[in-house]
Amino acid sequence: DNKGYCAQYRGEVCNAVLAKDALVFLNTSYADPEEAQELLVHTAWNELKVVSPVCRPAAEALLCNHIFQECSPGVVPTPIPICREYCLAVKELFCAKEWLVMEEKTHRGLYRSEMHLLSVPECSKLPSMHWDPTACARL
């Protein structure tokens, strides 16, 4: 599931969110990983047009870092997940109402885009920044 490679982000939609020249993980389960992941963001981005001004920037940051995860290069390139605390902040602080709607849409398969079911991250399954500060990405 986590087969892929590290590359500089060269897309458009997450330009304002991801660090300039960020190394991101591109998942080779897709035929064209850069395009596939960019398209997933686009699909979800359109949903974010209707969320509150408080939620939107937080949700965009979470979404971009969830789909274009930071990449740790090495013999086996590894995606670095978002830190649990940042995910929970978006879920419970900035986007509490919207999160419920997004979860509901996920369960009903409304985010299905061909082969990929775009789901909101499960915060509880993400590593905590208190366990190992290098094991997760901070937004």
Epitope: A31, L39, H116
Partner: antibody, heavy 119, light 112 residues
Framework: EVQLVESGGGLVQPGGSLRLSCAAS????????LNWVRQAPGKGLEWVSY????????DYADSVKGRFTISRDNAKNSLYLQMNSLRDEDTAVYYC????????????WGQGTLVTVSS | DIVMTQSPLSLPVTPGEPASISCRSS???????????LDWYLQKPGQSPQLLIY???NRASGVPDRFSGSGSGTDFTLKINRVEAEDVGVYYC?????????FGQGTKLEIK
Amino acid sequence: EVQLVESGGGLVQPGGSLRLSCAASGFTFSSYRLNWVRQAPGKGLEWVSYISSSTGSLDYADSVKGRFTISRDNAKNSLYLQMNSLRDEDTAVYYCARRSPYTGSLDNWGQGTLVTVSS
Amino acid sequence: DIVMTQSPLSLPVTPGEPASISCRSSQSLLHSNGYNYLDWYLQKPGQSPQLLIYLGSNRASGVPDRFSGSGSGTDFTLKINRVEAEDVGVYYCMQALQTPYTFGQGTKLEIK
């Protein structure tokens, strides 16, 4: 609804030039690789060229390398094929086709535009 | 380049009968991600090609379930379990693993 509409075909003399266009609508154009595929009269399908979304990577069939140039304008939702030094064997219907980034398949095709190279 | 070889090149079929087309590639189309990058297309008379099967065995949206794809590596098969008059046309396999993407010669299915 996804739509791809080719234009620019016509009759041209050997050695001449032609520029094909493909106008796209109904999908997030900038997130797809796009291809040109051609079909000579009564023959099979031959892939010609592709261009990636925003990364600028592209490739050509050996038969057109150095003569054809693929390009795109994401702001205009348009794909182009500049064809120079045309030969008789370039006579074909040229299709533009969208490649699914998830599966790699050419999941939508235009209706095609006929290019005839003849003196 | 990967060479795609289809057989038969002509396939006369009686309506209601099954049909089968074979496609062989000169090298494996199985990617390290577990997918076979092999598609099947149908070009009906006077029309553009349309996608039937992707990744070897997945039916494209709107394709009737009488069509099925199977195979892995270098050997693939398209089956139509009960041919209908509207299925006439030329069937092509295509490898989408690497450029240049290459097509089989095509199989012309006609009604007997």
